[in-house]
């Protein structure tokens, strides 16, 4: 009796304690992106960046996926969104087209049941880069918590993306999942 | 019979919910440190910042571990680090070695097991700052989405240490974890 | 007798369910609030932000509070609190008082328990806006992860507040609950 | 690669320039360093020129030693060397740590 | 600045060696370690305290923070015979010299 009732609760306790764990994995999806510079293009206007490792290096992804350079929704909730772009010139890469330039990112939704896109977050500055310094060096940063549904798409968009700074450490964005919608 | 079972239910449910509640709060680690501006050193050389604060003001820390002036993870995990590191420079202070400047920051990763370290973000900028202003400031701000092994650790270098603002509302890098490894 | 058990034990797991769940959801405040710019104060000072949205494009708020232009805590915990600030310039909006400007953001905490008002978290740049350029921009991020008590007030501070980037994309501050206070 | 050129045997008082050629890697992301070691002695640091062109120097060699830069070169220059500063001279870089070294360029001072 | 001892050791092949440096001001784990052999440049062996360089053998340990650091070599062999400095990359104002005196290792 007592005892069989016991046994019946510690397996109550085992079997949640699994759920539980279990549960609270699969509900927290994530990703960290970096930048895949094989493929920046050239130019000084705004480009959506297409080219971005998900399984190398410090890049991860889990229950969500990336498909055709954008980073897609799989579970609905509240996600805090960032974003990390350096961008350098060095003068042995050439003289830049312009020493006026405006480095900027924009973190971007898609939500394909409504074909429309709209920038959640912006960053950058506008810089003068002179031929009086041989290197120049920016980065941004930007962050910010955002409720996602299932299917939609992040991406991110760039001005001056020739200039990008290919490094993992340099160029990246991700998200991950806080809490779920009420 | 049925009574008995209640209030063993009832033990259950109470336990559980102080072992959930307990378990939730000791599998959290955090930590948010702000520099201890007594013994910044000169140059414009990139260093190591190894004198943090973990227990005064805002600084503080749970289940991970502040030695040698790392950060040591404790637990396995996905955690979401970031920093904010602020220079600045006032025309009473001297004048600057060179008008032309990188302010830059790593945050890096050491495994101890294999002794290697690796960045995982960067961020900065080159800067003009030039003597017809008598003060400048510049704030650079990372964050990003890692996963830890328990006894990697992380750490701050920073380029032109001399230009730290020693404030611990400027000058400060953390860790929170988020979720466990699958 | 066993049938009974098994019945009530499958109750205990699925109330043990929602309450997880349910607790889980309110355990989680959280704020994203965008600038309301019809009301952004003008002059170079160092002012107070008082007008933000909370129900409207990206801007949301549960189980926390914002009145009198403050965010309001409601539950103890662990908060990571963020904030980005844009400021632009365009030559149409008629000339700079001052070419060289400090851009500045603090983000800070009021109890008012202990009417004392300190800040959290600093960042910005000294600029210099020449005439020579017809447009200038210029971002801040920071964020940073704090212990927040049921009460405490959390408010933004700007200079040159008549800068400010009108955009929910690119002004705008938030915060989440990470983890309870042990 | 690092490579020291310009030493010589030199007489007292007189100028010398030393120069350091970079090859393999972008003098922008380093600082670059001079190192001396007397014959049977010990390493000394003289001071770098960072990636803005800033100076620092060793407290014994301010006022003593000038570093300047192009954009593949570093140059050293001792004015009114004395015989103590007959020595190897090493350029490096980066200050922390010294990771490439130069083979060295011998300086003797003596009238 | 840095203070380093012994000036001199002799150690037999496969003993092992301590080599000990001492900060005049606490410079954290910014301390690197180097090897030089007669005629040649100086060559890194560890930097930031403990990590060691790229090709360079695992009997090289480096330990110690603030101000007090251990070179420790295991094994040793033949080939290790040669002066050891360590220098902290710390602070390069208003230092005279950033390199410790040296420590000649002689292999029997």
């Known amino acids: 009796g007592s005892q069989h009732i016991r046994a019946e609760k510690a397996m109550v306790d085992g079997s949640w304690l699994d759920l539980a764990k279990r549960s609270k994995l699969e509900a927290q999806p994530f990703a960290h992106l970096t930048i895949n510079a094989t493929d920046i293009p050239s130019g000084s206007h705004k480009v959506s960046l297409s080219s971005w490792y998900h399984d190398r290096g410090w890049a991860k992804i889990s229950n969500m996926t990336f498909s055709n350079g954008k980073l897609i929704v799989n579970q609905d909730g509240f996600y805090y969104l960032y974003a990390n772009i350096c961008f350098r010139h060095h003068e042995t890469s050439g003289d830049l087209a312009t020493e006026y330039l405006q480095l900027m990112v924009y973190v971007t939704k898609t939500s394909i049941k409504i074909p429309s896109s709209h920038t959640l977050m912006k960053g950058g500055s506008t810089k003068y880069w002179s031929g009086n310094s041989e290197f120049h060096f920016y980065s941004i940063n930007v962050g910010g918590f955002f409720k996602l549904r299932s299917g939609e798409e992040i991406s991110i968009e760039v001005s001056n993306p020739s200039l990008l700074d290919p490094d993992q450490d340099a160029t990246y964005f991700g998200a991950f999942k806080v809490r779920d919608i009420d | 019979g049925s009574q008995h079972i209640r209030a063993e239910k009832a033990m259950v449910d109470g336990s559980w919910l102080d072992l959930a509640k307990r378990s939730k709060l000791e599998a959290q680690p955090f930590a948010h440190l702000t520099i201890n501006a007594t013994d910044i050193p000169s140059g414009s050389h990139k260093v190591s910042l190894s004198s943090w604060y973990h227990d005064r003001g805002w600084a503080k820390i749970s289940n991970m571990t502040f030695s040698n002036g790392k950060l040591i993870v404790n637990q396995d995990g996905f955690y979401y680090l970031y920093a904010n590191i602020c220079f600045r420079h006032h025309e009473t202070s001297g004048d600057l070695a060179t008008e032309y400047l990188q302010l830059m920051v790593y945050v890096t990763k050491t495994s101890i097991k294999i002794p290697s370290s690796h960045t995982l973000m960067k961020g900065g900028s080159t800067k003009y700052w030039s003597g017809n202003s008598e003060f400048h400031f510049y704030s650079i701000n990372v964050g990003g989405f890692f996963k830890l092994r328990s006894g990697e650790e992380i750490s701050i270098e920073v380029s032109n240490p001399s230009l730290l603002d020693p404030d611990q509302d400027a000058t400060y890098f953390g860790a929170f974890k988020v979720r466990d490894i699958d | 007798g066993s049938q009974h058990i098994r019945a009530e034990k499958a109750m205990v797991d699925g109330s043990w369910l929602d309450l997880a769940k349910r607790s889980k959801l309110e355990a989680q405040p959280f704020a994203h609030l965008t600038i309301n710019a019809t009301d952004i104060p003008s002059g170079s000072h160092k002012v107070s932000l008082s007008s933000w949205y909370h129900d409207r494009g990206w801007a949301k708020i549960s189980n926390m509070t914002f009145s009198n232009g403050k965010l309001i805590v409601n539950q103890d915990g662990f908060y990571y609190l963020y904030a980005n600030i844009c400021f632009r310039h365009h030559e149409t909006s008629g000339d700079l008082a001052t070419e060289y400007l400090q851009l500045m953001v603090y983000v800070t905490k009021t109890s008012i328990k202990i009417p004392s008002s300190h800040t959290l978290m600093k960042g910005g740049s000294t600029k210099y806006w020449s005439g020579n350029s017809e447009f200038h921009f210029y971002s801040i991020n920071v964020g940073g992860f704090f212990k927040l008590r049921s009460g405490e007030e959390i408010s933004i501070e700007v200079s040159n507040p008549s800068l400010l980037d009108p955009d929910q994309d690119a002004t705008y501050f938030g915060a989440f609950k990470v983890r309870d206070i042990d | 690669s690092l490579e020291e050129s310009g030493g010589r045997l030199v007489k007292p008082d007189e100028t010398l320039t030393l120069t350091c050629t970079v090859s393999?890697?972008?003098?922008?992301?380093?600082?670059i360093n001079w190192v001396r070691q007397a014959p049977g002695k010990g390493l000394e640091w003289i001071g770098y020129?960072?990636?803005?062109?800033g100076t620092w120097y060793a407290s014994w060699a301010k006022g003593r030693f000038t570093i300047s830069k192009t954009s593949t070169t570093v140059d050293l220059k001792i004015t009114s060397p004395t015989t103590e500063d007959t020595a190897t001279y090493f350029c490096?870089?980066?200050?922390?740590?010294?990771?490439?070294w130069g083979p060295g360029t011998l300086v003797t001072v003596s009238s | 600045d840095m203070t380093q001892t012994p000036a001199s050791v002799e150690v037999a092949v496969g003993g092992t060696v301590t080599i000990k440096c001492q900060a005049s001001?606490?410079?954290?784990?910014?301390l690197a370690w180097y090897q030089q052999k007669p005629g040649q440049p100086p060559k890194l062996l560890i930097y930031?305290?403990?990590t060691v360089a790229s090709g360079v053998p695992s009997r090289f340990k480096g330990s110690g923070f603030g101000t007090q650091f251990t070179l420790t070599i295991s094994g040793v062999q033949c080939d290790d015979a040669a002066t050891y400095y360590c220098?902290?990359?710390?602070?390069?104002?208003?230092?005279?010299?950033?390199f410790g005196g040296g420590t000649e290792v002689v292999v029997k």
């Open positions: 490096t870089r980066k200050y922390n740590p010294m990771d490439l």
């Open positions: 393999g890697f972008s003098l922008y992301n380093y600082e």
């Open positions: 020129i960072d990636v803005g062109s």
């Open positions: 001001q606490n410079i954290g784990s910014n």
């Open positions: 930031s305290t403990s």
């Open positions: 220098q902290q990359g710390y602070s390069a104002g208003n230092v005279n010299n950033p």
